[in-house]
């Protein structure tokens, strides 16, 4: 029961998650004018991945997309690929831990093979949660430095325009959104992980007992367990307590041909 | 076409009250941010105040602030600004303007007259 | 707050020749965001509201005659009337629309010579 809790936990945990990365990566306000010098501005500054924002006092808003991509700095497109590599991780996690879940039935699955479906949706959702925290991370690292070089140009005049006052760009909502949301990603993925534990070891240890029973005579095969996996057997000639190594066997995380009967 | 029709003015001593309306018609009044401008007997403009489309934020010179308070009726499509504690220099044609794209007041009211005098 | 200078106070040009009035502010208008200048010019006739002429220093507004062209960037502006009308009689006024408190330049009263 505590096993089904914190699988659909994680789920809950990693759904949402997920959906605040997506969220926080089609947000315009990654970046926001700083209005520490200006609080009563008729004219707002905000940034985007996608798009760069400006709202008047008037009521109107007029967003421009980066319609280039040659010319967009180096970061910026760093930023990008770590936000869709951690949404496209944790949809792909997402649609494997619903077929996880311990409380869906589908056909004859076997619970050690939901064990590593669970296994291997927890560890996508950890790397997608920790995608979105670096990108946010890297995107906060690139504000602070451009924060500081343009106040060093306000009071030094590196800026080279007389009577200009540079705009400076402080944290934007989407940043504070992407940092709770990969936490939340990474939590749950924690939760799989931890949920994987618990969904493994009846049918392990039955089936680590039952071999032993039929002695060491029996020939290696591969697939010979039929453990009904598509993501690796966490079973194969495995005592379940040898600490979690792993054998030459074991590295495959993609099914075989072997795997299907 | 876009209508604003000021009311309200009229004589009033120093250091008293007055409340100035602006009916609007002919736009989505909720939508735009709005503002009052004032034009004293044969002199330049001079902006008075400023209130955002969703009433949450407003906006005042040094002149006037403390003792001018900008408001909107959405529902009523109507501007007001109360006017306290006014002296002889508030004396001026008051417009309320319809703020456009790029903070420009696009749309104007034909003004009503104050007259602070004792 | 921004202070917006014109000049001059008063301009008489014949019927049909050019009119330049020019306008100063004492900070940037131009917007980094999106590279326009919040600067906007108004025309006031005799006992009349003011109208809107041009916005974001050179965007004229919509049924403004193109003899009206507005240029300039920063902190530097100017409205030119191309071929000045007898209809062209009036007051002129920038305005500072970037921050609060929306600033007035004085005015440039424009007559026919």
């Known amino acids: 029961m505590a096993v089904t809790a914190c699988q659909g936990l994680g789920f809950v945990v990693s759904l949402i998650g997920i959906a605040g990365i997506i969220a926080a990566t089609c947000m315009d306000q990654w970046s926001t004018q700083d209005l520490y010098n200006n609080p009563v501005t008729a004219v707002f500054n905000y940034q985007g991945l996608w798009r760069s924002c400006v709202r008047e006092s008037s009521g109107f808003t007029e967003c421009r997309g980066y319609f280039t991509l040659l010319g967009l700095p180096a970061m910026l497109q760093a930023v990008r690929a770590l936000m869709i590599v951690g949404i496209v991780l944790g949809a792909i996690g997402l649609l494997v831990s619903i077929f996880a879940l311990k409380c869906i039935r589908i056909g004859s699955m076997e619970d050690s093979a939901k064990a590593n479906m669970t296994l291997t949706s927890g560890i996508m959702f950890i790397v997608s949660g920790l995608c979105a925290i670096a990108g946010v991370s890297v995107f906060a690292n690139m504000l602070v430095t451009n924060f500081w070089m343009s106040t060093a140009n306000m009071y030094t005049g590196m800026g080279g325009m007389v009577q200009t006052v540079q705009t400076r760009y402080t944290f934007g909502a989407a940043l504070f959104v992407g940092w709770v949301a990969g936490g939340l990603t990474l939590i749950g993925g924690v939760m799989m992980c931890i949920a994987c534990r618990g969904l493994a070891p009846e049918e392990t240890n039955y089936k680590a007992v039952s071999y032993h029973a039929s002695g060491h005579s029996v020939a290696y095969k591969p697939g010979g367990f039929k453990a009904s996996t598509g993501f690796g057997s966490n079973t194969k000639n495995k005592k379940i307590y040898d600490g979690g190594a792993r054998t030459e066997d074991e590295v495959q995380s993609y099914p075989s041909k072997h795997d299907y009967v | 076409e876009v209508q604003l029709l000021e009311s309200g003015g009229g004589l009033v001593q120093p250091g008293g009250s007055l409340r100035l309306s602006c009916a609007a018609s002919e736009f989505t009044f909720s939508n735009y941010a709005m503002s009052w401008v004032r034009q004293a007997p044969g002199k330049g403009l001079e902006w008075v105040s400023t209130i955002s489309s969703g009433r949450s934020s407003t906006y005042y010179p040094d002149s006037v602030k403390g003792r001018f308070t900008i408001s909107r009726d959405n529902s009523k499509n109507t501007l007001y600004l109360q006017m306290n504690s006014l002296r002889a220099e508030d004396t001026a044609v008051y417009y309320c303007?319809?703020?456009?794209?790029?903070?420009?007041?696009?749309?104007w009211g034909q003004g009503t007259l104050v007259t602070v005098s004792s | 707050d921004i202070v917006m200078t014109q000049s001059p106070d008063s301009l008489a040009v014949s019927l049909g020749e050019r009119a330049t009035i020019s306008c100063k502010s004492s900070?940037?208008?131009?917007?980094?965001?999106?590279?326009?200048?919040?600067l906007t010019w108004y025309q006031q006739k005799p006992g009349q509201p003011p109208k809107l002429l041009i916005y974001?220093?050179?965007t004229r507004e919509s049924g403004v005659p193109d003899r009206f062209t507005g240029s300039g960037s920063g902190t530097d502006f100017t409205l030119t009337i191309s071929s000045l009308q007898a209809e062209d009689v009036a007051v002129y006024y920038c305005q500072n629309a970037y921050s609060y408190p929306f600033t007035f330049g004085g005015g440039t009263k424009l007559e026919i010579k």
């Open positions: 900070q940037s208008l131009l917007n980094s965001g999106n590279q326009k200048n919040y």
């Open positions: 303007a319809k703020l456009g794209r790029g903070n420009a007041m696009e749309y």
């Open positions: 974001w220093a050179s």
